[in-house]
C-alpha cells in the first residue's frame, strides 16, 4: 500500500505518461496543406500533458514508442461530394527535423467523409508531427468529428 | 528484482488499469437510439475490469484520461443500402450525469457499412457513456464486427 | 526520485510492455488469404518488443489484454474498383493453437480502399495472430498505408 501511495506521489512526467489530444484550430493558407491544431482545458476536452504545440503542430518532448491516432471529417460532405473531390488525402508524418521527415500514416477519403486510424511509431524528443490534408474540401471543426492525439506507450 | 515482484503483488486496480471491451447485446426500442452492451468472459472475449454496466451502458469508476474505441458494422449491408439510408450516424458521448453530457466521437456511414474510430478523452468516476445509432439499419451483433471499449491511460 | 531511477533500470520486459508494429512483407500464394508481415528497425519504423514473428505471423509471448490495431489499404484502388471487387474483407484472428482459433476483428472494404480499426482482446502466450485478406485486390506495401500492431495493456 505504501508503494501505491509513493507511486501516486511521483510526478506523472517521470513515469513517461506523455499524452495529448487536440482539436482543429484552422487550416493553413491555400498552398499549405497542414492542419493547425489547438489544445487545452479551456477549449473543451483537448489537452497536452508533455507534448507541446509549435505554431499549431505537435512537438514531442519524450523519446519512446507512441500510439498516434487521428480522425478527420470533411465539412458539408456527402459520398457524392467526397467522390467528386477525389483524391482527398490525409497524411500524418514527422515534418521536422527535416532529417527525420517521413510519412507515418496516410488515408484517402474516396466516397467517404470521415477517415480514422491509429498506429504505433517510435518518436524522438523534438519530432514535430504534421497532418496534411490535400484536396479542396474543408475539415469539420466539430470536436467530436475531427481530432488528433498521441499517447506514449513505452521507451 | 524485489521491486518487480512487489509491483506484481499490488492489486491491479491500485495501478489504475481500468479497461473494458463490450459486445452488442441489443438495440433499444424504436424511439431509443442507444445501443445496449454486454460484457464478461462467459460471453466470449468481452470483459470489464473496473468500469461497470448500468442497464447496458458503460459507467466509469476511475477518474482519468481514457482511450475510447468503437467499431459498428451494419447488418446485411451493402454500399447501396448504406447510401440509401444516409444519414446513418454513430455517436459516442457522456449521457449522464446530465451536467457533463457531451458528444465525444461521431461518424456517419455514408456509403460504408462499418465505422471504426478511437480517441483520448478525460472521464470522471460516474460518467456513463452512451452509443447512439441513428438510422433504420440494424447493427451486426457479431462480436468481431461490433464492439466498444475503454482503456484507462493516465490520471 | 530514486524510485523513478530504479524503475528505469528494470528490464522493460518485466513491466509487461510487450509491443509490436509490423509492415507488410508479402501476400501468400493464391489459396492462402493470409498477409505475411515483417518488422525490425532495419526495415524502417516497424519493431517487435516481446512478440515474435513465426513465418510472417505474429506470435504473442506474454499473457494479457492487448490492443490490436490494423490498417490495410488496397493497391491501385478507387471506389469503383473496390465496389466492383466486393466482397473484399479483412479479418484478424487467432489462428493457432487451433483450440483457440477465433475471429477477433473483421471489416469489409465496400466502396472504400482502406480499412482501419482496433480492439482490446485477451491474448495468451503462444497465440498466433493471422490477418486474412479475401478478395482479388492486392494490399499496398507502403508502410504508411498498411500496418498491423499489438500493444500489451494489462494482465
Amino acid at each position: 500500500q505504501r508503494f501505491a501511495q509513493a507511486q501516486q506521489q511521483l510526478p506523472l512526467e517521470s513515469l513517461g505518461w506523455d499524452v495529448a489530444e487536440l482539436q482543429l484550430n484552422h487550416t493553413g493558407p491555400q498552398q499549405d496543406p497542414r492542419l493547425y491544431w489547438q489544445g487545452g482545458p479551456a477549449l473543451g476536452r483537448s489537452f497536452l500533458h508533455g507534448p507541446e504545440l509549435d505554431k499549431g503542430q505537435l512537438r514531442i518532448h519524450r523519446d519512446g514508442i507512441y500510439m498516434v491516432h487521428i480522425q478527420v471529417t470533411l465539412a458539408i460532405c456527402s459520398s457524392t461530394t467526397a467522390s467528386r473531390h477525389h483524391p482527398t488525402t490525409l497524411a500524418v508524418g514527422i515534418c521536422s527535423p527535416a532529417s527525420r521527415s517521413i510519412s507515418l500514416l496516410r488515408l484517402s477519403f474516396h466516397q467517404g467523409c470521415t477517415i480514422a486510424s491509429q498506429r504505433l511509431t517510435p518518436l524522438a524528443r523534438g519530432d514535430t508531427l504534421c497532418t496534411n490534408l490535400t484536396g479542396t474540401l474543408l475539415p469539420s471543426r466539430n470536436t467530436d468529428e475531427t481530432f488528433f492525439g498521441v499517447q506514449w506507450v513505452r521507451p | 528484482q524485489r521491486f518487480a515482484q512487489a509491483q506484481q503483488q499490488l492489486p491491479l486496480e491500485s495501478l489504475g488499469w481500468d479497461v473494458a471491451e463490450l459486445q452488442l447485446n441489443h438495440t433499444g426500442p424504436q424511439q431509443d437510439p442507444r445501443l445496449y452492451w454486454q460484457g464478461g468472459p462467459a460471453l466470449g472475449r468481452s470483459f470489464l475490469h473496473g468500469p461497470e454496466l448500468d442497464k447496458g451502458q458503460l459507467r466509469i469508476h476511475r477518474d482519468g484520461i481514457y482511450m475510447v474505441h468503437i467499431q459498428v458494422t451494419l447488418a446485411i449491408c451493402s454500399s447501396t443500402t448504406a447510401s440509401r439510408h444516409h444519414p446513418t450516424t454513430l455517436a459516442v458521448g457522456i449521457c449522464s450525469p446530465a451536467s457533463r453530457s457531451i458528444s465525444l466521437l461521431r461518424l456517419s456511414f455514408h456509403q460504408g457499412c462499418t465505422i471504426a474510430s478511437q480517441r483520448l478523452t478525460p472521464l470522471a468516476r460516474g460518467d456513463t457513456l452512451c452509443t447512439n445509432l441513428t438510422g433504420t439499419l440494424l447493427p451486426s451483433r457479431n462480436t468481431d464486427e461490433t464492439f466498444f471499449g475503454v482503456q484507462w491511460v493516465r490520471p | 526520485q530514486r524510485f523513478a531511477q530504479a524503475q528505469q533500470q528494470l528490464p522493460l520486459e518485466s513491466l509487461g510492455w510487450d509491443v509490436a508494429e509490423l509492415q507488410l512483407n508479402h501476400t501468400g500464394p493464391q489459396q492462402d488469404p493470409r498477409l505475411y508481415w515483417q518488422g525490425g528497425p532495419a526495415l524502417g519504423r516497424s519493431f517487435l518488443h516481446g512478440p515474435e514473428l513465426d513465418k510472417g505471423q505474429l506470435r504473442i509471448h506474454r499473457d494479457g489484454i492487448y490492443m490490436v490495431h490494423i490498417q490495410v489499404t488496397l493497391a491501385i484502388c478507387s471506389s469503383t474498383t473496390a465496389s466492383r471487387h466486393h466482397p473484399t474483407t479483412l479479418a484478424v484472428g487467432i489462428c493457432s493453437p487451433a483450440s483457440r482459433s477465433i475471429s477477433l476483428l473483421r471489416l469489409s472494404f465496400h466502396q472504400g480502399c482502406t480499412i482501419a480499426s482496433q480492439r482490446l482482446t485477451p491474448l495468451a502466450r503462444g497465440d498466433t495472430l493471422c490477418t486474412n485478406l479475401t478478395g482479388t485486390l492486392l494490399p499496398s506495401r507502403n508502410t504508411d498505408e498498411t500496418f498491423f500492431g499489438v500493444q500489451w495493456v494489462r494482465p
Epitope: - | L24, Q30, T73, A75, I76, T80, T81, R84, H85, T136, L137, L138, S140, R141, N142, E145 | -
Partner: antibody, heavy 120, light 111 residues
Framework: EVQLVQSGAEVKKPGSSVKVSCKAS????????MHWVRQAPGQGLEWMGA????????SYNQNFKGRVTITADKSTSTAYMELSSLRSEDTAVYYC?????????????WGQGTLVTVSS | DIVMTQSPDSLAVSLGERATINCRAS??????????MHWYQQKPGQPPKLLIY???NLESGVPDRFSGSGSGTDFTLTISSLQAEDVAVYYC?????????FGQGTKLEIK
C-alpha cells in the same frame, strides 16, 4: 400511426396492364422501402418488388420477368405498382406493405389490398 | 431463392392448449447475429398481421401467448394457450436476402 390506403378493385383483360396505387399517411414516406406482395385466391403470399421513394431505387422479384414496374411520387406520398401482359393467373389481391422502422423486408403496415381480376 | 417450408399444413388444437407451427428454410436465414425470420397471422378478408420479427421479437400489441424461437434454418411459432380469436392462417417469411419468400401457410383451427 402509418396508414396505407390502396386504390379500388380492377377487372382487366388478358394482355392488358393494371396500375395499383398506395397512399401513405405521415411524413416518413421517402425514408422507407415500400413493398408489393400479392396473394392469389386461396393461395399463399408472394413478394413482387419494392421501391425506396427517397431515390426511386427499385428491386424486383425475377419471377415476374420484367412485367412489374414500381414507381413512387414523393409529393403525394404515393407508390404505384404496374403489372403488364396480364394473364388469368395474375388474378390476386395485391398489397402494399412496409416496415415500421427498420429497413429490412418484414412488414408491420399493410394496405387493405386491391383485388385485380383478369378475365376475358 | 430461399424456399420456406411450413409444417403442418393444417393444425387442430383445443382451446387453452399449446399450438406449435414449424418453418424450415432451404438455407440459413441467420446473419450478423440475427435470424431474419418473421411470422404473420392472416384472417379471411384481411391483410396479414405481423406477430413476430427477427425470430423471437414480439411485435407491439401482440399478446404474449405468441412466441417465436429458432435459428439458422429451423424456426417455431408457439401459441401457449390457444384462444378462439387465434383461428387463422399463419405464415413464416424470411428477409435474409432478396427476394424475401413466404412459407405456404399453416391453417390453425379449433379441435
Amino acid at each position: 400511426e402509418v396508414q396505407l390506403v390502396q386504390s379500388g378493385a380492377e377487372v382487366k383483360k388478358p394482355g392488358s396492364s393494371v396500375k395499383v396505387s398506395c397512399k401513405a399517411s405521415g411524413d416518413t414516406f421517402p425514408r422507407y422501402n415500400m413493398h408489393w406482395v400479392r396473394q392469389a385466391p386461396g393461395q399463399g403470399l408472394e413478394w413482387m418488388g419494392a421501391i425506396f421513394p427517397g431515390n426511386g431505387e427499385t428491386s424486383y422479384n425475377q419471377n415476374f420477368k420484367g412485367r412489374v414496374t414500381i414507381t413512387a411520387d414523393k409529393s403525394t406520398s404515393t407508390a404505384y405498382m404496374e403489372l403488364s401482359s396480364l394473364r388469368s393467373e395474375d388474378t390476386a389481391v395485391y398489397y402494399c406493405a412496409r416496415n415500421s422502422y427498420y429497413d429490412y423486408a418484414w412488414f408491420t403496415y399493410w394496405g387493405q389490398g386491391t383485388l385485380v381480376t383478369v378475365s376475358s | 431463392d430461399i424456399v420456406m417450408t411450413q409444417s403442418p399444413d393444417s393444425l387442430a388444437v383445443s382451446l387453452g392448449e399449446r399450438a406449435t407451427i414449424n418453418c424450415r428454410a432451404s438455407k440459413s436465414v441467420s446473419s450478423s447475429g440475427y435470424s431474419f425470420m418473421h411470422w404473420y397471422q392472416q384472417k379471411p378478408g384481411q391483410p396479414p398481421k405481423l406477430l413476430i420479427y427477427l425470430a423471437s421479437n414480439l411485435e407491439s400489441g401482440v399478446p404474449d401467448r405468441f412466441s417465436g424461437s429458432g435459428s439458422g434454418t429451423d424456426f417455431t411459432l408457439t401459441i401457449s394457450s390457444l384462444q378462439a380469436e387465434d383461428v387463422a392462417v399463419y405464415y413464416c417469411q424470411h428477409s435474409r436476402e432478396f427476394p424475401p419468400t413466404f412459407g405456404q401457410g399453416t391453417k390453425l383451427e379449433i379441435k
